[in-house]
Interface confidence: low
């Protein structure tokens, strides 16, 4: 931000009413006063360039210093071209001199040359030549000095000149202020430059009207420098949930939108499925019956719980079942739905239910399915079995309700047997079998079921209480066809897959495991 | 050749309006302060108005305030003179008048506002 | 406002003769005053500028002179062309008022 001036002194501003001394009196600097654009302006000036050795003082009037601590002179002023002048003018010279002195109090008309100070020689960028000063073109130049730290409660300038033709037209003092500033969202203010050069005042910020430092974040700071100049700006204010910055100020949220936290964000229009918010709002209110999970963004619409898987099928296969279903029609909004599968099972002699969590196998875990199908196996055959999917979503856990479909399925028959070939001969074929434990206890023998490949009039039949047969009197190197189904008290169960099964060729004799 | 050339005078009832026009060619016009300068008939110079080479400031005689209005347009290199509320004593030849415009400061030296170039006049006369 | 005083009013001479106009102001104007030549039916000529400055075009014979409040044109060798009405005009103020006009006439 640009320095602020505050001005001391201003020779031209005044018009001519400063009264400055000069010295000697009545000899050397003079008041002129002149028309620039049709306006009185008056000047200092002083011309004895033919008249040999020169020392002429003005000084000006006192100056209270007040808070400033280094002080800023500006001078406008033209210089003529020795030159211009008769031979030259040997005494005549291009430069004048710029001098201060300190006091706490005013001298009045008692001016001493000893006590003022040398500033610098000033000198013109451009003089004023001949042909400028005929055809009244101005070479205006200007110069500027600083000077401190000052201490004293006043002090005066002092210009000498030593045989110059020089007009001083504008004489500025003034010292220099970072301005009050608005940055940031914090506000810093007016602030004294400092007297030196490298040094840079710090000065805190403070945050506006509804700003916050963020958490984590830096107090906001600036640094003021010589020049009155803003620098090196260090943190920042944030508008605090329910405001949003406007210009330099934060404005609270209008009615119907929101802000959840302190951030650079503008408020934010409230969600879908919210109440209108007031103003100055940080979040919006869900409507009945919709809710908002803790790990919701305040700007994500509010959100139910989903309706109940659309459609739910149950296709029994032996002592499995596949459950299929298709996804909620009404998501709540959501896209986190998950679905829990429970089991139930029934004996139908008693009616008896119960859990049956314990006694079957899922494919994948039953609770936080993402998938819409499970399958189920391990069942008990002659059992009724209800099944219920139930969907959740991130907000079902904040309502007591549930929605969930359910399927039954009854089971009549064990389960098929796994049937393996255990062994071979030219004249036998050794097989076995295994059914699921808990199906077992069910199961009163096994019936093995065998015919020659292509003869579909005439097939054999074995019973057995265990879990394996050997078959005998086989022909060589011919294949067979061997199903194994089991019976229980109420009748067959599921009979496995028909296995082709080949004896030996007599070459190859010999008991030969497989 | 610098060439002002006055027009827009003639005879007014009292109280009337007239507007004067003054052309110029010949120099660099923008760059010139002008002014209006009217003499009575038999009698000497009377300075009126004047404007800045870019439209302001502009400045006016006691006894033509607030009744004469003073404007220029560089681009067609033209002055002009609004005389409203016309008086029998504002009957007279009206110069119009340019100066070098000079410049922003002169030290120890005067602004350069005599007149260095006239017109040839026109006469305004106010009667009933 | 600055009051301009010209004398005389008016003077008759002759070819070649020395003339001298006086310029008075009512308060100081430093060297700001300019002198003009008007014959009959005609518009003002510059003639000086800043007192003593000879205006671009303008004869030798014209000289002016003066500052503060008084003020002086001088012909110095009077020339039929030159018999005229001559105005002095101060410019340190706003109104850059004239003087009366100082008739020269033939003798």
């Known amino acids: 931000a640009q320095g602020k001036e505050v001005v001391l002194l201003d020779f031209a501003a005044a018009g001519g009413e400063l009264g400055w001394l000069t010295h000697p009196y009545g000899k050397g600097w003079d008041l002129m006063q002149n028309i620039m654009n049709d306006m009185p302006i008056y000047m200092y000036s002083v011309c004895n360039v033919m008249s040999g050795d020169q020392d002429n003082w003005l000084r000006t009037n006192w100056v209270y210093r007040g808070e400033a601590e280094r002080i800023f002179i500006e001078l406008k002023f033209t210089v003529r071209d020795c030159n211009s002048f008769p031979g030259g003018a040997s005494s005549c010279k291009e430069t004048f001199n710029l001098y201060y002195a300190e006091s706490d109090l005013d001298y009045g008309t008692n001016f001493q040359k000893r006590l003022f100070t040398k500033i610098d020689t000033i000198a013109p960028d451009e003089i004023t030549v001949s042909s400028d000063f005929e055809a009244r073109h101005v070479k205006l130049n200007v110069e500027e000095r600083s000077v401190g730290p000052l201490t004293r409660k006043g002090f005066y300038l002092a210009f000498q000149d030593i045989g110059a033709c020089v007009a001083l037209l504008s004489v500025r003092v003034y010292y220099k202020k970072c301005p009050e500033l608005l940055q940031g969202l914090a506000h810093f203010p007016e602030t004294i430059a400092g007297s030196d050069a490298p040094s840079l005042a710090t000065v805190a910020g403070t945050c506006v009207d509804h700003a916050v430092v963020p958490p984590g974040g830096e107090e906001p700071r600036m640094h003021c420098a010589v020049d009155g100049e803003w620098l090196v700006p260090i943190g920042q204010c944030l508008c605090q949930a329910g405001y949003e910055k406007v210009e330099d100020a934060c404005q609270a949220c209008s009615p119907g939108f929101f802000k959840f936290e302190a951030s650079e964000s503008p408020c934010l229009e409230c969600p879908e499925h919210t109440l209108p918010s007031p103003e100055g709002a940080t979040s919006c209110e869900c409507e009945e019956g919709f809710f908002r999970a803790p790990q919701d963004p305040a700007s994500m619409p509010c959100t139910r719980p989903p309706s109940a898987p659309h459609y739910l099928t149950a296709v029994g296969m032996g002592a499995k079942v596949e459950l299929r279903w298709t996804p909620p029609q009404d998501s709540g909004g959501r896209e986190d739905i998950v679905y829990s599968v429970t089991c139930e099972q029934c004996w139908p002699e008693s009616g008896e239910c119960g859990p049956c969590e314990a006694s079957v196998r899922y494919s994948e875990p039953p609770h936080g399915l993402t998938r819409t199908s499970v399958t189920v196996s391990d069942l008990e055959p002659h059992m009724n079995y209800t099944f219920t999917v139930e969907a959740r979503n991130g907000v079902s856990g904040l309502v007591t309700s549930r929605s969930f479909r359910t399927a039954s399925v009854s089971i009549n028959q064990t389960e098929p047997p796994k049937v393996r070939l255990e062994g071979r001969s030219t004249t036998s074929l050794s097989v076995s079998w295994s059914i699921p434990p808990p199906q077992q206890s069910r199961v009163w023998k096994y019936e093995v079921t065998y015919r020659k490949k292509g003869d579909s009039n005439s097939y054999n039949v074995r019973r057995t209480e265990g879990f394996s047969v050997t078959l005998d009197d086989l022909a060589p190197d011919t294949t067979y066809l061997v199903q194994v189904q089991a019976l229980t008290q109420e009748g067959q169960g599921a009979g496995s897959k028909v296995h082709e099964f080949q004896t030996l060729s007599p070459e190859g004799s010999g008991n030969l495991a497989v | 050749e610098v060439q002002l050339l006055e027009s827009g005078g003639g005879l007014v009832q009292p109280g009337g309006s007239l507007r004067l026009s003054c052309a110029a060619s010949?120099?660099?016009?923008?760059?010139?302060?002008m002014a209006w300068v009217r003499q009575a008939p038999g009698k000497g110079l009377e300075w009126v108005s004047r404007?800045?080479?870019?439209?302001?400031?502009?400045h006016y005689a006691d006894s033509v305030k607030g009744r004469f209005t003073i404007s220029r347009d560089n681009s067609k290199n033209t002055l002009y003179l609004q005389m409203n509320s016309l008086r029998a004593e504002d009957t007279a030849v009206y110069y119009c008048?340019?100066?070098?415009?000079?410049?922003?400061?002169?030290?120890?030296?005067?602004?350069?506002?005599?007149?260095?170039?006239w017109g040839q006049g026109t006469l305004v006369t106010v009667s009933s | 406002d600055i009051q301009m005083t010209q004398s005389p009013s008016s003077l008759s001479a002759s070819v070649g003769d020395r003339v001298t106009i006086t310029c008075r102001a009512s308060q100081s104007i430093s060297t700001w005053l300019a002198w003009y030549q008007q014959k009959p039916g005609k518009a003002p000529k510059l003639l000086i500028y800043?007192?003593?400055n000879l205006h671009t075009g303008v004869p030798s014979r014209f000289s002016g002179s003066g500052s503060g409040t008084e003020f002086t044109l001088t012909i110095s060798g009077l020339q039929p062309d030159d018999f005229a009405t001559y105005y002095c005009q101060q410019y340190q103020s706003y109104s850059r008022t004239f003087g009366q006009g100082t008739k020269v006439e033939i003798k």
């Open positions: 010949g120099f660099t016009f923008s760059h010139y302060m």
């Open positions: 404007i800045g080479p870019s439209g302001g400031p502009t």
């Open positions: 008048a340019g100066y070098d415009s000079g410049y922003d400061y002169v030290a120890v030296a005067g602004p350069a506002e005599y007149f260095q170039h």
């Open positions: 800043k007192a003593s």
